[in-house]
């Protein structure tokens, strides 16, 4: 729902976006994701911070935890035990990396309205979770895993070898957290809480990245992180399962690694419980084009886990790496052996397949020149998934239901026609057995969250419609947005163009390219955003374009895997090609073209500036990668192979920003990096700067002391203010 365009008579009451609007988050939106606790009940934190339980069927709601109780321990998060007897309250949140944080946990007993005293949890805890049934607790403290039968009981220590930066139990090390699991945890309860599976990561032999954290003391601290860069020694992973009822009986039992995986360096990629006595593990060769899914069963007689070769399913890519960004995870059906999984079909599009015995005999469930993106839920008779099929726009997401109980299976788009103009990009959240679900629409109009009946798909109520945001935007001159495509040499380049409110095709506008461009990413999406580039279009009259070139996702393997083993080539070429096409459109001032990007986008923007095309007047790189030898093994090697002579060292060397230092002579370059970036190390920008100095090339730079890859807090304001000044100066726009 975009505010409607106004007539000229009202135009003087409209104002442009300001940078202050963006930095203050004035036009941020809310989403509503129910915290499902049954088929028809969910928890939600109310505006006044009470934790409220809603029953959809009775229409009743009641407060299970008051804001007073929350405030008494300064709780910022909570978790209800499945038996509804206890709530954990989380406070003293302390961020570590992207997903990980430590916190203090208090357990509140709902039956007597008191905090559990005696055998309190230690602090700070690295991860804590309830069992799926009852109120057992598993937690990680000082890299070791502990179990509590009930919150008031003393803990049982499961692991003893945990050591900071050396051995991680139940939590991932840096590289597994960021590049493989994308979680803060590495432990998984079985469906009824009988077993607890966990990963142990041994980082003993991993080289350490060290950087200064300046703080306020006389001497800076040194932060040390075991961080495997491309080609370096990797973590050694082992998976164990322990019986939580009898944990000391045989202790943790290691799950065997498939022989074809164990023969060389490998990764563990995910674990999925099927039943209490069946578990599915996914493994990946270090050269990430072979993945093995292994289904293992508990052997009561030996108290061990058996993973027969007949239950090993191999997924191999011959044109690129296995999977998309990650290898997809299976969604098991009710027979507890067959499953649904997304992988490439024979035409090179990612689709849902049903695997009953072997991958070779998989039954393809979806097909077409589009991609299935996520399987949300499989019930006895339905499979819910998202795809970008509708109207052939890759940057959209709609939710579909396939009836699997009937033959042939029928397909229905649940969301395509609900709020067609407002909502083209959805995700969903399902209650138990998909009795109900919430739809969260991210745009292109103002986001809206709604509740639906899982059988009829009927909308029950609006959970969040962002009325205040809608009202606040009524007198704002928002830029216009259009999503279109360019056809170039058999490649389709989708782009999003953000145009000034009074855009006139007969005039010339400065162009800013915003680029990310990383493998399996997508920038051109039909989502709502009022952000920095909205301001640049609205107030500063710039045209901003985002282009999805080769290497980006959800348009088939040909586009996705085009960049395999040669990062930094086609992504850059496609941005340049798009710019040339935009110039041909007639409304771009070709003397005022800039490019900017962050992270992978900083790498692409740097290479584009140094391409020698003369297209770009200036550009900005925020926290860029400058050489793939400096980045994490798991990510880099997935797309580039190894930096060895007999593998791909030559392209590692050819694809650095430093190698192009000379080419920066004719552009204005602003290089920005946080000194405490744990992800893309400051080293990357330090090496660019060194190369530019050595080449006697002038450039501008800004560092952010003690800031990580996100440049958050006050740094954000400083960053965007600084970049705005730089662009306005580049485009000769008055301040």
């Amino acid at each position: 729902l975009r505010p409607s365009r106004v007539h000229n008579s009202e135009e003087n009451t409209m104002r442009a976006l300001t940078l202050k609007d963006i930095l203050n988050g004035t036009f941020s939106y809310k989403t509503f994701f129910p915290n499902w606790i049954s088929g028809q009940e969910y928890l939600h934190q109310s505006a006044d911070n009470n934790i409220v339980l809603y029953n959809i069927e009775t229409g009743q709601s009641y407060t299970i935890l008051s804001n007073r109780t929350m405030k008494s321990v300064n709780a910022s998060n909570y978790g209800l035990s499945p038996d509804r007897q206890f709530v954990y309250l989380e406070s003293d949140y302390s961020k570590l990396w992207r997903y990980s944080y430590t916190a203090t946990y208090y357990i509140y007993d709902l039956s007597n309205g008191e905090f559990v005293r005696g055998n309190e949890l230690p602090r700070p805890i690295q991860y804590l979770c309830w069992s799926p049934v009852g109120s057992k607790l598993a937690y990680v403290y000082q890299n070791n895993i502990y179990l509590k039968q009930r919150p008031g009981d003393p803990p049982f220590q499961i692991t003893f070898n945990g050591r900071e930066n050396k051995i991680f139990n139940g939590i991932p090390d840096w590289v597994y957290e960021e590049e493989m699991l994308a979680t803060k945890y590495a432990l998984w309860w079985s469906p009824n809480g009988k077993f607890l599976a966990y990963a142990e990561f041994n980082d003993t032999d991993i080289p350490v990245i060290a950087y200064s954290y300046y703080g306020d003391e006389q001497y800076p601290r040194t932060i040390n992180i075991p961080y495997p860069k491309a080609g370096a020694k990797n973590p050694v992973v082992r998976i164990f399962i322990i019986d939580t009822t009898y944990p000391a009986y045989v202790g943790p039992q290691e799950v065997p690694v498939p022989a074809m995986i164990a023969s060389s360096d490998y990764y563990f990629s995910w674990l999925t419980w099927v039943t209490d006595e069946r578990v599915c593990l996914q493994w990946l060769k270090r050269v990430q084009n072979v993945s093995v899914l292994s289904i293992c069963d508990f052997r009561e007689d030996w108290q061990t886990w058996d993973c027969p070769k007949t239950q090993e399913h191999i997924e191999e890519s011959r044109t690129g790496w296995a999977g998309g960004f990650f290898v997809s995870t299976p969604v098991f059906s009710y027979d507890a052996i067959s499953y649904y999984k997304i992988f490439s079909d024979k035409d090179g599009y990612k689709h849902i397949h049903y695997i009953k015995d072997t991958v070779e005999n998989a039954i393809q469930i979806t097909s077409g020149k589009w991609e299935a993106i996520n399987i949300f839920r499989v019930t006895q008779d339905s499979l819910f998934y998202s795809s970008n099929e509708f109207e052939e726009y890759p940057g959209r997401r709609n939710i579909y239901r396939i009836s699997i109980g009937s033959y042939p299976p029928s397909k229905k788009c649940v969301t395509c026609h609900l709020r067609k103009e407002r909502c083209q990009y959805y995700t969903a959240s399902f209650s138990d057995y998909a009795k109900y679900y919430a739809l969260v629409c991210y745009g292109p109009g103002i986001p809206i969250s709604t509740l639906h009946d899982g059988r009829t798909d009927q909308e029950i109520k609006i959970l969040e419609e962002n009325k205040e945001l809608e009202n606040a935007l009524k007198n704002i001159q928002l830029p216009k947005e259009e999503i279109k495509k360019l056809e170039v040499d058999e490649i389709t380049l989708w782009y999003k163009m953000i145009l000034p409110p009074q855009f006139d095709r007969s005039k010339k506008y400065p162009l800013l390219i915003q680029v990310y461009g990383g493998p399996c990413s997508q920038s051109v999406r039909s989502v709502f955003a009022v952000n920095w580039i909205s301001y640049l279009a609205s107030k500063e009259g710039m045209v901003i374009a985002l282009v999805d070139g080769r290497g980006t996702a959800f348009q088939g393997d040909k586009l996705l895997y085009a960049v395999y083993r040669k990062l930094g080539v086609y992504e850059v070429e496609d941005q340049i090609t798009a710019v040339r096409k935009f110039i041909e459109m007639g409304f771009i001032d070709e003397k005022r073209i800039a490019i900017w990007g962050w992270s992978y986008g900083g790498y692409v923007s740097s290479l584009a500036l140094a391409s020698g095309t003369g297209l770009f007047k200036c550009g900005i790189a925020v926290a860029p990668v400058s050489s793939w030898e400096y980045y994490a093994s798991v990510y880099t090697e997935r797309f580039m192979g190894l930096p060895t002579k007999d593998d791909n060292l030559e392209h590692y060397k050819n694809s650095t920003v430093m190698a192009r230092a000379e080419y920066f002579r004719n552009v204005d370059y602003l290089l920005i990096h946080g000194t405490a970036d744990d992800n893309v190390h400051f080293q990357n920008s330090a090496q660019i700067a060194k190369a530019l100095v050595n080449a006697q090339v002038d450039f501008q730079a800004m560092w952010y002391s003690d800031q990580n890859h996100g440049l958050s807090g006050l740094s954000t304001n400083h960053l965007y203010t600084h970049m705005t000044h730089f662009l306005k100066q580049c485009f000769s726009l008055s301040d």
Partner: antibody
Framework: EVQLVESGGGLVQPGGSLRLSCAAS????????MSWVRQAPGKGLEWVSW????????GYADSVKGRFTISRDNSKNTLYLQMNSLRAEDTAVYYC???????????WGQGTLVTVSS | DIQMTQSPSSLSASVGDRVTITCRAS??????LNWYQQKPGKAPKLLIY???SLQSGVPSRFSGSGSGTDFTLTISSLQPEDFATYYC?????????FGQGTKVEIK
């Protein structure tokens, strides 16, 4: 407050039978392994038997295997020990105890005396 | 079965003394070793679990250490109420076994 109260002890002739009961309160009985431990007069402690939370899994000391049967009724929060073919050496105070994680006995009843004598 | 051997079988000590009782397992039991106190006519009471963890409500003068096969219970400063019999117990393989006990008497 956790409480375990044993009952059913007494004097029985060799070869006879006895059924001990243990009433539990103050905790979620159905979630824990429960156990019997005995102590002969003037002697040390000897573990007798344990039973899993659902009652499907049990364990016995060699000295009582085949003669004693442990059971539980989770709806009544009660633990039982059926003792058959009793011998003089079974004379002891029998304690009901919660066997946390199958590893340590964190709560004990006050005990009930079983005397096997003719 | 795993045998547990406690030493000494009895000891005499005065109030304020530091008392150490040892327990040896016939094979490695990791840290699955627990200590109990029993007074005449009463049920045993858990003092230390998992070799070194103090049970809730137990005074801090009691401490445990060790792993593998050799374990120690220490009372840092003996109090009048500490005169009792102490038992160690191993908790592996769902076959618990106790030591024969150590009687701590007033000197």
């Amino acid at each position: 407050e956790v409480q375990l109260v044993e009952s059913g002890g007494g004097l029985v002739q060799p070869g006879g039978s006895l059924r001990l009961s243990c009433a539990a309160s103050g905790f979620t009985f159905r979630g824990y392994i429960m156990s019997w431990v005995r102590q002969a007069p003037g002697k040390g402690l000897e573990w007798v038997s344990w039973i899993g939370p659902e009652g499907s899994r049990t364990g016995y000391a060699d000295s009582v295997k085949g003669r004693f049967t442990i059971s539980r009724d989770n709806s009544k929060n009660t633990l039982y020990l059926q003792m058959n073919s009793l011998r003089a050496e079974d004379t002891a105070v029998y304690y009901c105890a919660r066997l946390l994680y199958g590893t340590w006995f964190d709560y004990w009843g006050q005990g009930t005396l079983v005397t096997v004598s003719s | 079965d795993i045998q547990m051997t406690q030493s000494p079988s009895s000891l005499s000590a005065s109030v304020g003394d530091r008392v150490t009782i040892t327990c040896r397992a016939s094979q490695s039991i990791s840290s699955y070793l627990n200590w109990y106190q029993q007074k005449p006519g009463k049920a045993p009471k858990l003092l230390i679990y998992a070799a070194s963890s103090l049970q809730s409500g137990v005074p801090s003068r009691f401490s445990g250490s060790g792993s593998g096969t050799d374990f120690t219970l220490t009372i840092s400063s003996l109090q009048p109420e500490d005169f009792a019999t102490y038992y160690c117990q191993q908790g592996t393989l769902l076959l618990p076994t106790f030591g024969q006990g150590t009687k701590v008497e007033i000197k």
